[in-house]
Interface confidence: low
Amino acid sequence: ASCREVCCPVGPSGLRCTRAGSLDTLRGLRGAGNLTELYVENQQHLQRLEFEDLQGLGELRSLTIVKSGLRFVAPDAFRFTPRLSHLNLSSNALESLSWKTVQGLSLQDLTLSGNPLHCSCALFWLQRWEQEGLCGVHTQTLHDSGPGDQFLPLGHNTSCGVPTVKIQMPNDSVEVGDDVFLQCQVEGLALQQADWILTELEGAATVKKFGDLPSLGLILVNVTSDLNKKNVTCWAENDVGRAEVSVQVSVSFPASVHLGLAVEQHHWCIPFSVDGQPAPSLRWLFNGSVLNETSFIFTQFLESALTNETMRHGCLRLNQPTHVNNGNYTLLAANPYGQAAASVMAAFMDNPFEFNPEDPIPVSFSPVDGNSTSRDPVEKKDETPFG
């Protein structure tokens, strides 16, 4: 039987709305929850497409609105239709379409022919897509002050680019408790929005934002050492697209060190953690004398999945230590803001020659004084494989 409704089902998950002039919104289409295909035609009163219109159409793959009165598609119109891959908006009254509208979609084809599109920087993204042959873009009519049926590039004098974003940082070193002033300078045509992304800063500083385009200010009040390695990002958008730049504020603080008890792995490991900004230099002592690192006793830093912290973790690796390695291990850490030390006793093996003189020690020691000629321990960082 023929369908006399405004919108008629097509197959198991399609809907076709072609009765002229009967729709002015797509909101509340009945049974739309499982739709994968929506075809709309001859709806001259359908003028706007907002994100609310497609709410609940999460399965939508194909949307066609043709020969209708569509004049505005909101930048977030497809927020609720992430699976949309085919979009046909031909023969409407669209003069422009924001790059934000299609951002995040994996469109296989986009058809905009038959719209009075105005050639401007706002459509630069579309021209780029068409030139690069991306996702089967069809525009056919892109007007540059006058009508025409061919793709018209922007004039040579027109410079269409995303904004230029720069963050000005303090020149001097920043210390715990300081207030830090950052300024984001934005340049570009038709600037729309700009802001800071500060999600990583929670707990690291009190944030005060001020100013508006083209210059945004940010004060980080009473900064803590937690601010290190955290991104402060400034972004800006215009008709052409989005740009962002990130910086990290380096907050100086004294060295600190923590040692754990030796644990037996493939090699023995005396675990340590060191912190400080700038990163402190390290030196090991064994029973009060400098421990010169060798291929069998060496410092190894563990690769951390966390790139957003200053604390470094590692091991003093000891390859098959014997009783001669039993003793007191001290790790000294120092940077320009302070020094720290931590010690731990390690007993790897009982002395099998209790009543005999001790064997020669297989590591070289030298007293910790100004005359020492021993070299500092070599930091073998992430290139040293674990174990």
């Epitope: 919104t25 509340g28 003028q47 609310e52 422009s96 105005h118």
Partner: antibody, heavy 117, light 106 residues
Framework: QVQLQQPGAELVKPGASVKLSCKSS????????MHWVKQRPGQGLEWIGE????????NYNEKFKNRATLTVDISSSTAYMQLSSLTSEDSAVYYC??????????WGQGTSVTVSS | QIVLTQSPAIMSASPGEKVTMTCSAS?????MHWYQQKSGTSPKRWIY???KLASGVPTRFSGSGSGTSYSLTISSMEAEDAATYYC?????????FGSGTKLEIK
């Protein structure tokens, strides 16, 4: 801080025209629609139309389409509404209000128009 | 055009009393928006997208509804809530407002 500044009052004669202004500050003028809303004394709100400054695109309530003209001056971030062929029915407060992706977020203080001979 | 009918037109409530006013649309709208207007001042956005409170609106206010039927509720009336409340649809041109509910304090 966002501000929409409107003159306090206008007195005009029947049959004449009036051009009302709404000066914007504190935001990017071209990125927001500007709406005009009429309120007669002791009555409700009536939408007249909207304009998008970046391209001058307009939409009107059919009731006002032939008498209301919305324009903008981007250089001064000012929106205008010209209302022609005025009668006593047009005596009202006229508000401008801006919107982007949400409804009318900020309103002007309104201009009181009195049509009287 | 979509006609919005608000009821009641006028109501009064005592401090601490729960207040509910309704807005009925002549055809389905996706969201309803509410504005508060006090005498001699411009309207203020009060509730948008049916249930989101605008900045600075006390949490005793709430909004709900769908389709053609929407409501604004005040859980506990306070003197400063006395005002006229207008609903508005933003689904089709022309944008339309309800005729308003005038809320008075007893």
């Amino acid at each position: 801080q966002v501000q929409l500044q409107q003159p306090g009052a206008e007195l005009v004669k029947p049959g004449a025209s009036v051009k009302l202004s709404c000066k914007s500050s504190g935001y990017t003028f071209t990125n927001y629609w500007m709406h005009w809303v009429k309120q007669r004394p002791g009555q409700g709100l009536e939408w007249i139309g909207e304009i998008y400054p970046s391209n001058g695109r307009t939409n009107y309530n059919e009731k006002f389409k032939n008498r209301a003209t919305l324009t903008v001056d981007i250089s001064s971030s000012t929106a205008y509404m010209q209302l022609s062929s005025l009668t006593s029915e047009d005596s009202a407060v006229y508000y401008c209000a801006r919107s982007r992706y949400d409804p009318m977020e900020d309103w002007g203080q309104g201009t009181s128009v009195t049509v009287s001979s | 055009q979509i006609v919005l009918t608000q009821s009641p037109a006028i109501m009064s409530a005592s401090p601490g009393e729960k207040v509910t006013m309704t807005c009925s649309a002549s055809s389905s709208v996706g969201y309803m928006h509410w504005y508060q207007q006090k005498s001699g001042t411009s309207p203020k956005r009060w509730i948008y997208d049916t249930s989101k409170l605008a900045s600075g609106v006390p949490t005793r206010f709430s909004g709900s509804g769908s389709g053609t039927s929407y409501s604004l509720t005040i859980s506990s009336m306070e003197a400063e809530d006395a005002a006229t409340y207008y609903c508005q649809q933003w689904s089709s041109i022309p944008l339309t407002f309800g005729s308003g509910t005038k809320l008075e304090i007893k």
